[in-house]
């Protein structure tokens, strides 16, 4: 997988008036890395591993960059003409990647009220607009504003691309991201399925990097894909990942089944616990949280794009 840096900024308006402040999160290699602390007006690392990336250096540069980006996005939102009453959001996601062959990719995406309306490849400067008429109108609005703004010249987009890559390389130089391995915690649970059957679920949590093999075995042999259900490998908010795999088995045959896990060159096997059947409500229902937007406008539903 490529190394990536992703900026996720959101600004809000209420009854046509752009609100002060902004929400910002930065993800490094898909993990929450920085967020903008509105109270302290500073970029803050998310967890110990993020702190380790910069070591004893300050986060002033990140604070300056996020503040500047937030200000730009507020100005952009102010130029969107169709703002009706109530709450509206403008979200910008900027991503840059360095691939194994050292090739790079950069892109920028704008969302209005959670709907994508404009994308740009920052290397080719090619714009993409979805088909819907609303998206076309919004995109025209924003592109016109960006063209008017002297700052949004060709050099600006090259700079955005270069700056993002420069930052990504700076973070990678620390070696923390490349070196870091956190082994998973694995646990197996069982739940009532139907008459004579039980569902066994194997969960792996708190691991890094995200690549993992998690599969059920019967008598030491991996079950076929169609007899297993997998959950997505998702960030758990602590700079690590979580996932699960489940299968249905006949009661009384538990001893034949083990969950096999392989991660970063290490492996383990985990038997099905015997004894009382636990009745679980559901298998790890993953909810997409709104990362702080709820704090401001609890009653309003703003879609947050991951």
């Amino acid at each position: 997988e490529p190394h990536s840096l992703r900026y996720n900024l959101t600004v809000l308006s209420w009854d046509g008036s752009v609100q002060s402040g902004f929400l910002a999160e930065v993800h490094l290699d898909g993990q929450p890395f920085l967020r903008y602390d509105r109270q302290k007006c500073r970029a803050k690392p998310q967890g110990q591993w993020a702190e380790d990336v910069l070591g004893n250096k300050t986060w002033d540069r990140e604070t300056r960059d996020l503040t500047g980006n937030g200000k730009d996005l507020r100005m952009t939102l102010a130029h969107i003409k169709d703002q009706k009453e109530g709450l509206h959001s403008l979200q910008e996601i900027r991503v840059c990647e360095i691939h194994e062959d050292n090739s790079t990719r950069s892109s920028q995406h704008f969302y209005y009220d959670g709907e994508l309306f404009l994308s740009q490849n920052l290397e080719t400067e090619e714009w993409t607009v979805p088909q819907s008429s609303r998206a076309q109108t919004l995109a025209m609005n924003v592109r016109n504003f960006l063209k008017e703004d002297a700052m949004k010249t060709k050099t600006h987009y090259h700079a955005m691309h270069a700056d993002c890559l420069q930052e990504l390389r700076r973070y990678l130089e620390s070696g923390v991201v490349l070196r870091r391995t956190v082994p998973p915690m694995v646990n197996v649970t069982r739940s009532e399925a139907s008459e004579g059957n039980i569902t066994v679920t194997c969960r792996a949590s708190s691991f890094y990097p995200r690549n993992i093999i998690l599969t059920w075995r019967q008598d030491g042999v991996s079950l076929s894909h169609d007899t297993q259900q997998w959950g997505d490998v998702l960030p758990d908010g602590n700079g690590t990942y979580q996932t699960w795999v489940a299968t249905r088995i006949c009661r009384g045959e538990e001893q034949r089944f083990t969950c096999y896990m392989e991660h970063s060159g290490n492996h383990s096997t985990h038997p099905v616990p015997s004894g009382k059947v636990l009745v679980l409500q559901s298998h790890w229902q993953h909810h997409h949280h709104h990362h702080g937007l709820n704090d401001i406008f609890e009653a309003q539903k703003i879609e947050w794009h991951e």
Epitope: D219, G220, V221, S222, Q255, T258, Y260, H267, P271
Partner: antibody, heavy 118, light 107 residues
């Protein structure tokens, strides 16, 4: 490549016990089960049981419960089968086998001949 | 326990022949059927697993088929090195059980 090297032939007296070893090489020992199979002279094969080397978990053929005990030594990548209270019925060639995770008994040891005789 | 029956205990064939060895289970084993080759020196090798999947390194002249309770192993072009005893084995239900074997000889 995967190899299972079994211990040499054993001649034991009735009532005694014997421990057959199976040393694995060419793969990560704790990744895959070790299975044991019996073949009496000129007869078919009988599955005895298997062990998960990672955690020592065992599953036995009911017929061999109390007769065979399966263990492993992770440090030497060796699996053992202990047979007790031997009788002439236990005279046979004993095989260990392992899996590649996709099929049972994928790779086999060369077999160990156990002869029970007074 | 599931009984695995190989009705033909020995079989004579000529080099180049197409040979089929059959195996019957006492109940449905859902394709969990494997075939093994045992050479006269006692060496055992996996040939086919899950009814028809060829184990890596096994010559393509070996093939397997079947479903439910009836299964077969076919050698399409018999070679000298195929002289051995062939065992079927079910992996569907514990305890795992083997057929009594079919000894293949050259005419």
């Amino acid at each position: 490549q995967v190899q299972l090297q079994q211990s040499g032939p054993e001649l034991v007296k009735p009532g005694a016990s014997v421990k057959v070893s199976c040393k694995a090489s060419g793969y990560a020992f704790t990744k895959y089960n070790i299975y044991w199979v019996k073949q009496s002279h000129g007869k078919s094969l009988e599955w005895i049981g298997y062990i998960d080397p990672y955690n020592g978990g065992t599953v036995y053929n009911q017929k061999f419960k109390g007769k065979a005990t399966l263990t492993v030594d992770k440090s030497s990548s060796t699996a053992y089968m202990h047979l007790n209270s031997l009788t002439s019925e236990d005279s046979a060639v004993y095989y260990c086998a392992t899996t590649d995770g996709y099929s049972l008994f994928t790779y086999w040891g060369q077999g160990t001949l156990v002869t029970v005789s007074a | 326990d599931i009984q695995m029956t190989q009705t033909t205990s020995s079989l004579s064939a000529s080099l180049g022949d197409r040979v089929t060895i059959s195996c019957r289970a006492s109940q449905d084993i859902s394709n969990y059927l494997n075939w093994y080759q045992q050479k006269p020196d006692g060496t055992v090798k996996l040939l086919i697993y899950y009814t028809s999947r060829l184990h890596s390194g096994v010559p393509s002249r070996f093939s397997g088929s079947g479903s439910g309770t009836d299964y077969s192993l076919t050698i399409s072009n018999l070679e000298q090195e195929d002289i051995a005893t062939y065992f079927c084995q079910q992996g569907n239900t514990l305890p795992f059980t083997f057929g009594s074997g079919t000894k293949l000889e050259i005419k």
